[in-house]
């Protein structure tokens, strides 16, 4: 026997009280598929969370977080306040990274910079708080009679002193 | 943690009314719908209605004696009953769920509940 549930269309629900009759969802629900016999409360966006999409009767509301905040979670559950490049948010706030570390986003932790040296590697580029530093060629790749490829100096015009 | 309280109980004569508040603390009702069960002593646990954004729904065995309403700014949700009969004697509880109506849901919370005695 089939359910007389079954034919309620995603937006109703399914009326156990009422000879099984579909009723649509009040406002502010949803039931985003049929046979329901409930409807699911509407996510409210509110506080540091704003609507990206509105609650309709057959899908939930979908929120982001207010500028100087960013979501974190499934569905943006959380909104957690953004800091600047070189900081990590602790629990009393934006804080710069430490000497030895770098954030180049708004979010998230401080990581240590990268060891050039593990990788026998030399530093190019000194890091800073917002930075990593960028590794260069190795020392044997600088050493005399390396095999890397030099474009030649230019050539200087006699009685000229260098630039 | 979202703590409900139920008030208003008490003895009524038959074919009286009484109204129930059910208050919430912790947390607003704004994102929930609110709902009244009942259990009578010796009996299962009965659905009574529940509110939501301007909407009621009621079980099938009140007949347009108990209407449920919402007070806002007081943050408490009424349970209005008349005509009332012996058989509605009972502990009235109010519960809040993400799910409208609740009759076939068990809810998120659930007060402590309030007595209702109809005896002449």
């Known amino acids: 026997l089939q359910d007389p549930c079954s034919n309620c269309p995603a937006g109703t629900f399914c009326d156990n009280n009422r000879n099984q009759i579909c009723s649509p969802c009040p406002p502010n629900s949803f039931s985003s598929a049929g046979g329901q016999r409930t409807c699911d409360i509407c996510r409210q966006c509110k506080g540091v969370f704003r609507t990206r999409k509105e609650c309709s009767s057959t899908s939930n509301a979908e929120c982001d977080c207010t500028p100087g905040f960013h979501c974190l979670g499934a569905g943006c559950s959380m909104c957690e306040q953004d800091c600047k490049q070189g900081q990590e948010l602790t629990k009393k706030g934006c804080k710069d990274c430490c000497f030895g570390t770098f954030n180049d986003q708004k979010r998230g932790i401080c990581r240590p910079w990268t060891n050039c040296s593990l990788d026998g590697k030399s530093v190019l580029v000194n890091g800073t708080k917002e930075r990593d530093v960028v590794c260069g060629p190795s020392p044997a790749d600088l050493s005399p009679g390396a095999s890397s490829v030099t474009p030649p100096a230019p050539a200087r015009e006699p009685g000229h002193s260098p630039q | 943690e979202v703590q409900l309280l139920e008030s208003g109980g008490g003895l009524v004569q038959p074919g009286g009314s009484l109204r129930l508040s059910c208050a919430a603390s912790g947390r607003t009702f704004d994102n929930y719908a609110v709902g009244w069960f009942r259990q009578a002593p010796g009996k299962g646990r009965q659905y009574v209605g529940t509110y939501w954004s301007g909407y009621a729904h009621y079980g099938d065995f009140e007949n347009n004696r108990f209407t449920i309403s919402r007070d806002n700014s007081k943050n408490t949700v009424y349970l209005q009953m008349n005509s009332l009969r012996a058989e509605d004697t009972a502990v009235y509880y109010c519960?809040?769920?993400?799910?409208?109506?609740?009759?076939?849901?068990?809810?998120?919370?659930q007060g402590q509940g309030t007595l209702v005695t109809v005896s002449s």
């Open positions: 519960a809040i769920s993400l799910k409208y109506p609740m009759a076939t849901v068990t809810p998120d919370y």
